[in-house]
């Protein structure tokens, strides 16, 4: 019996087609992805093949103005239109709190939404009961396929799930649910979830009875043969893991941003054992036409976005200096504003020991692309912010050793004076450079804001200590020459859309007046 699994993950609000790098589509003839194009391909496969499942491994939420405006209603609407069979919850589905998940998505989706390792307690338990499930038995042709869901247990540190959801260890939570499916004589089981490729592989290895793992969160690109675009494969598709009980378990993921549609064909024997698995992600490029009815629907929903981008978010009573002449040479107040917003966006999990789990931000000055003049009545709009942060990136959470941070700050000024983009703006950090010293030895003082303290204060950076830092995904991926971050980071979790982070902060503060205050000397 043959099953075709079509899968997406980490789509992050890319409802419209995008450029090759998943930013705003400029030249339509070279654009990719989007739900209208995805629908064309999905329908083509559904017509050609008998047993097809369309699955999403989480993080539909967060990433473009679509999510900012529609807050998840757009996800439910267009996933319903594409007739997804099931979705696993990702960490970003909790970005607007539990209510922001329940109302727009859980109550509106026509397909089951899954996670076995999220347990509700207190008053939320009855409110959310039945809106998401640990597993689903999906009838496909004359057979049934069990799907078990899972979500990153780090979600409380990455999003806003509140205090009434407990995120258990994925493997511990999945095993009893898989055992139940086996009891029901469901012998073909897919683990669908959002914990990253390393955890996906562990699930394949450790959870008895799981036949296939369809993952997300780490934006992993797998491919067999010559890759069709810029993404470099992290391994073959499917990636085969040998389980502890000796089975060959295919593990797949489909990069991110709706650029590819994962396509996996699995052949099962009559006892539900995987006989063979093969496939590849399908690049959704312009050779695949956009479905006209979905495209028309997208255009209808678009109207509200254009109106939103010119509305006032808040006011500034000072000039927001985002000029390259400032931000690539010295501390600039636009850099301070953005870093403050980045930290504010990550305020969660205070307890008796920690006032917050992260206090530090770094931001390449070259990523700040425009100032905002306060003389326009002080008004700040989404449009203004899109000029400051035009690349459609995210502000991510990483864990780094102090020694890596020190290298990053040395790199920040290794060729100072040439108006290069690597000069770092900061938050929760005081850095002193001596530019008379030779490159690689210019950081003379590097103090960082404590987190394990009731009164935050600046302490010298410790080389062997592990620190959490918020930074643009561009830096996490080694951009502007920050190879040491990419090579030495201990953990990387993707965060929220950059403009969204700053716009939310400005809306919250209402009036802003960021200063240059001696963070960089």
């Amino acid at each position: 019996w043959e099953l075709t699994i079509l899968h997406t993950n980490d789509v992050h609000s890319r409802l419209e087609q995008t450029s090759e790098d998943s930013s705003k589509c400029v030249n339509a003839s070279r654009c990719m992805g989007g739900v209208a194009r995805l629908f064309t391909k999905v329908q083509q496969i559904r017509r050609a093949e008998p047993n097809v499942l369309l699955l999403d491994a989480g993080d539909q939420y967060q990433g473009t103005i679509w999510f900012t405006v529609y807050k998840g209603a757009e996800v439910a609407h267009f996933m319903n239109a594409l007739r997804y069979d099931a979705m696993a919850l990702g960490n970003h589905e909790f970005d607007n709190g539990v209510e922001g998940l329940i109302e727009p998505l859980l109550k509106e989706a026509k397909f089951p939404i899954l996670s076995a390792n999220i347990k509700a307690k207190g008053p939320l338990a009855s409110q959310i009961s039945g809106l998401y499930l640990p597993y689903k038995v999906l009838p496909v042709g004359d057979e049934v396929v069990g799907i078990v869901g899972y979500t990153s247990k780090e979600t409380p540190f990455l999003s806003n799930p509140g205090t009434n959801l407990v995120f258990e260890d994925e493997i511990t939570a999945l095993q009893p649910e898989v055992d139940k499916l086996k009891t029901l004589n469901v012998n073909k089981i897919i683990a669908l979830g959002h914990s990253g490729f390393e955890t996906d592989k562990l699930i394949a290895q450790k959870v008895r009875g799981v036949d296939v793992v369809v993952g997300g969160h780490s934006n992993t690109f797998l491919y067999t043969g010559n890759p069709p675009s810029k993404e470099v494969p992290a391994g073959k598709y499917p990636f085969i893991v040998t389980s502890d009980d000796g089975r060959k378990v295919p593990v797949v993921q489909a990069y991110a941003f709706g650029k590819y549609l994962g396509y996996l064909k699995i052949e099962f024997d009559e006892r539900g054992n995987v006989i063979s698995s093969h496939g590849n992600p399908i690049l959704l490029n312009s050779s695949i036409p956009e479905d006209p009815s979905i495209k028309a629907d997208i255009n209808k929903w678009r109207i509200k976005l254009d109106n939103y981008s010119t509305q006032e978010l808040g006011k500034t009573i000072v000039y927001l200096d985002g000029s390259s002449q400032s931000c690539r040479f010295r501390e600039c107040n636009m850099g301070n504003l953005i870093c403050d917003a980045m930290i504010n966006n990550n305020l969660r999990h205070a307890d008796e020991m920690f006032w917050n789990h992260v206090s530090m931000c770094i931001l390449n000055g070259g990523g700040i692309r425009s100032p905002i003049d306060e003389r326009n009545n002080g008004t700040i709009t989404w449009e203004n912010l899109a000029a400051v942060l035009p690349f459609g990136g995210t502000f991510d959470l990483v864990q780094l050793k102090g020694s890596t941070l020190k290298k990053a700050f040395e790199h920040s000024v290794h060729r100072y004076g040439q108006s290069t983009g690597e000069f770092l703006q900061v938050g929760g950090i005081h850095v002193v450079y001596d530019l008379s010293r030779k490159p690689g030895d210019r950081v003379v003082k590097l103090d960082v804001l404590c987190t394990k303290c009731r009164v935050p204060s600046y302490d010298p950076l410790k080389m062997d200590e592990i620190y959490k830092v918020i930074l643009p995904n561009f830096l996490a991926n080694g951009g502007d020459g920050f190879q040491m971050i990419k090579d030495e980071l201990l953990r990387h979790d993707s965060g929220d859309q950059d403009i969204n982070v700053v716009s939310t902060y400005i809306s919250k503060m209402k009036v802003i007046y960021p200063a240059v205050e001696g963070r960089i000397k």
Partner: antibody
Framework: QVQLQQSGAEVKKPGASVKVSCKAS????????IYWVRQRPGQGLEWIGW????????KYNEKFKGRATLTADTSASTAYMELSSLTSEDTAVYYC????????????WGQGTLVTVSS | DIQLTQSPSFLSASVGDRVTITCKAS??????VAWYQQKPGQSPKLLIY???TRHTGVPDRFSGSGSGTEFTLTISSLQPEDFATYYC?????????FGQGTKVEIK
């Protein structure tokens, strides 16, 4: 809250067919199986089959295969059970039901529809 | 088909009594067993699923146990509203089947 509202009682002649409806409310219809169970007068319960409104797949108890047809109208959030070639043995209360977790017990029941087959 | 045999078929008990109903399966069904309560003229109500998990809103005097072929439903202290017929059901193998029922009457 989850509710399943069934159509009213029916009296049918032997050899005829009957179609019982079950309107669901209080939840997303396409996300849960609808099960059909019958209970003959003074007897126990008998499972007829299920339909998954998400993709209209069905499963029948072999005893009813060929005579029972399960369908669903997602736009009306309504499931239907049609039973053909009726005999007096089919006189029973017919229930639709829904689960909490797939297959694992019928948590929500309709009020039942009495079908009487009599010449 | 898997046969489920409940015992006893009838049971007379008083308020406050501890009542145990057993359900034997003709072949193993692991823990894929549910228990229902039905009162005359009403639809059945789910009490227990997965052999021992109480359904939402079911009083904790009701408990289920067992696996494989032998299952029990226990009412720790019988209340006036508990007089009804109780059915077990297996959902491990098709066709899903029910026990013949146990009627709990007032002594």
């Amino acid at each position: 809250q989850v509710q399943l509202q069934q159509s009213g009682a029916e009296v049918k002649k032997p050899g005829a067919s009957v179609k019982v409806s079950c309107k669901a409310s209080g939840y997303t219809f396409t996300r849960y199986y609808i099960y059909w169970v019958r209970q003959r007068p003074g007897q126990g319960l008998e499972w007829i089959g299920w339909i998954y409104p998400g993709n209209f797949n069905t499963k029948y108890n072999e005893k009813f295969k060929g005579r029972a047809t399960l369908t669903a109208d997602t736009s009306a959030s309504t499931a239907y059970m049609e039973l053909s070639s009726l005999t007096s043995e089919d006189t029973a209360v017919y229930y639709c039901a829904r689960d909490v977790y797939d297959y694992a017990g019928f948590a929500y029941w309709g009020q039942g529809t009495l079908v009487t087959v009599s010449s | 088909d898997i046969q489920l045999t409940q015992s006893p078929s009838f049971l007379s008990a008083s308020v406050g009594d501890r009542v145990t109903i057993t359900c034997k399966a003709s072949q193993g069904v692991a823990t894929a067993v549910a228990w229902y309560q039905q009162k005359p003229g009403q639809s059945p109500k789910l009490l227990i699923y997965w052999a021992s998990t109480r359904h939402t809103g079911v009083p904790d005097r009701f408990s289920g146990s067992g696996s494989g072929t032998e299952f029990t439903l226990t009412i720790s202290s019988l209340q006036p509203e508990d007089f009804a017929t109780y059915y077990c059901q297996q959902y491990s193998s098709y066709p899903w089947t029910f026990g013949q029922g146990t009627k709990v009457e007032i002594k």
